[in-house]
């Protein structure tokens, strides 16, 4: 809390103005009136001004507006932003997309904050929807922003979207978004060829169905294991062991290692033994010979 | 593609004079608030000067302070810095800077000039 | 406000995580920035605000800190990375930097 003093005389702030840099904390408090700052907020940005005389400046701001700031101030907050804690952001009303851009542009080099999040909520409830051109602002900032939304949220995401995508960034998505963004992606790589295909898809073939799996063991393309053991388990136990160790190439030894996890182990339990054992790896645990498979599932839709 | 290119330094006796130049290329330089840093040989960062977009608003560093002078051209692109008095200890490489807008960090730096002080 | 960097210099090899530190005289806030300095080569900021990457910034280097005790750390140090650098505080006027520290090659 700055103390209140009386403002020297010819000092007096009439505009927001480079004179300002060199004042003191107190002169800042005590010659700057809050309703000017509010109306020439853009011009604080072009000053290059120290995090306590920020500070002094948030302040006057808090006083003038206990509510909540009005966009029209949100929107030139410029560096103040990172001087914001998440219950001041609360307050806001954030509709206009120029806003939320001016003020993630202030934040990009920070991993998504608490300040961030809380300002993303105040968007997306003030706007009522979580638009396309929200999640194309929001993927380009925050890639990894995907993983927090819901499946049903996931649906709008456009296509184009999903090129800044970085792998790290589905770190934390779990199965049902990667069954949603899967088709988004396979939909905006389609025009690659196929290695390059595979490097962008690869951190998406979570969400890939058996067909497409299948499509791609006929292109020598190398999967390694720590994908493959991401892929979803019913779309991997309909591949025969050919298919997988096409998929695998080199790699396929690798399923010794992981022969105890899924979806390794379900595959390998409804593989014939005898297959299994053309691979050379050891695998036990596949349908001895001579043993028929019965897919009851089958009987039972049949019946 | 910004940059910043000093030039200027040389060999000088105590007590002599010699101004740098800083020609600035890449953004808006009227837009922006530019320093001077020094950086004496085997030694740290020191900021020296500092000039405000419009140039009315200047600071010096204590230890150079009566004896340097900072101003800028806008209409040139440039940034000066007239030094006199030489000392000893201003022996050293002079960088020019941008400072961010609206933040007090310097965004640009130049490659530096060397300006060494001796009899 | 006084800045001061430890170590002065270190020896390191590719790969390794090297950690430098930087302790202001008072408390600056989060007001912390980074530079990288190549021999020969202009200073370039990496990180401000303590902990925010500048654009164009490997993943690698983070920073931390908030207060007085401040730490850049490189995670897995690359052939590019042997430099000396330097905080800076912006947290009031007059600016000042640390002493520096150099990460040279074991």
């Known amino acids: 809390e700055v103390e209140k003093t009386a403002c020297p005389s010819g000092k007096k702030a009439r505009e927001i103005d480079e004179s300002l840099i060199f004042y003191k904390k107190w002169e800042l408090e005590a010659c700057v009136d809050a309703a000017l700052l509010a109306t020439q907020m853009d011009r604080v940005n072009a000053i290059p001004f120290t995090y306590e005389q920020l500070d002094v400046l948030k302040h006057k701001l808090d006083e003038l507006y206990p509510q909540g700031y009005p966009e029209s101030v949100i929107q030139h907050l410029g560096y103040l932003f990172l001087k914001m804690s998440p219950e001041d952001i609360r307050k806001w009303n954030v509709t206009s997309l120029e806003t939320l851009k001016a003020l993630l542009e202030v934040n990009k080099g920070h991993e998504m904050s608490p300040q961030v999040a809380t300002l993303i909520d105040r968007f997306v409830k003030g706007r009522g929807q979580l638009d396309k051109d929200t999640l194309d602002t929001l993927t380009a900032f925050y890639p990894g922003y995907l993983c927090s939304l819901s499946p049903e949220e996931l649906s709008s995401v456009p296509p184009s979207s999903i090129w800044a995508v970085r792998p790290q960034d589905l770190d934390t998505c779990d199965p049902r978004q990667l069954d949603v963004l899967y088709p988004k992606a396979r939909l905006a790589f389609q025009n690659m060829n196929g290695s390059e295909y595979f490097v962008k898809i690869q951190s998406f073939l979570g969400g890939a169905p058996t067909e497409d799996l299948k499509a791609l063991s006929q292109q020598n393309v190398s999967m390694d294991l720590a994908t493959f053991m991401k892929l979803r388990t019913d779309a991997v136990l309909p591949l025969t062991v050919a298919e997988v160790q096409k998929l695998l190439g080199p790699h396929v030894e690798g399923l010794k290692a992981e022969e105890r996890h899924r979806p390794v182990r379900d595959w390998i339990l409804r593989q014939r033994q005898d297959d299994l054992d053309t691979l050379g790896l050891g695998l036990q645990g596949g349908i001895p010979n001579g043993y028929l498979v019965l897919d009851l599932s089958m009987q039972e839709a049949l019946s | 593609q910004v940059q910043l290119v000093e030039s200027g330094g040389g060999l000088v006796k105590p007590g002599g004079s010699l101004r740098l130049s800083c020609a600035a290329s890449?953004?808006?330089?009227?837009?922006?608030?530019m320093s001077w840093i020094r950086q004496a040989p085997g030694k740290g960062l020191e900021w020296v000067s500092y000039?405000?977009?419009?140039?009315?608003?200047?600071y010096y560093a204590d230890s150079v302070k009566g004896r340097f002078t900072i101003s800028r051209d806008n209409a040139k692109n440039s940034l000066y810095l007239q030094m006199n008095s030489l000392r000893a200890e201003d022996t050293a490489v002079y960088y020019c800077?941008?400072?961010?807008?609206?933040?007090?960090?310097?965004?640009?730096w130049g490659q530096g000039t060397l300006v060494t002080v001796s009899s | 406000i006084q800045l001061t960097q430890s170590p002065s210099s270190l020896s390191a090899s590719v790969g390794d995580r090297v950690t430098i530190t930087c302790r202001a005289s008072?408390?600056?806030?989060?007001?912390l920035a980074w530079y990288q300095q190549k021999p020969g080569k202009a200073p370039k900021l990496l990180i401000y605000?303590?902990?925010s990457l500048e654009s164009g910034v490997p993943s690698r280097f983070s920073g931390s800190g908030s207060g007085t005790d401040f730490t850049l750390t490189i995670s897995s140090l690359q052939p590019e990375d042997f430099a000396t650098y330097y905080c800076?505080?912006?947290?009031?006027?007059?600016?000042?930097f640390g002493g520096g520290t150099k990460v040279e090659i074991k």
């Open positions: 800077a941008s400072l961010q807008r609206g933040l007090a960090l310097f965004q640009h």
């Open positions: 890449g953004f808006t330089f009227s837009d922006y608030y």
């Open positions: 000039i405000s977009s419009s140039g009315s608003t200047i």
């Open positions: 008072q408390g600056i806030s989060s007001a």
């Open positions: 605000d303590a902990s």
């Open positions: 800076q505080q912006f947290n009031s006027y007059p600016l000042t």
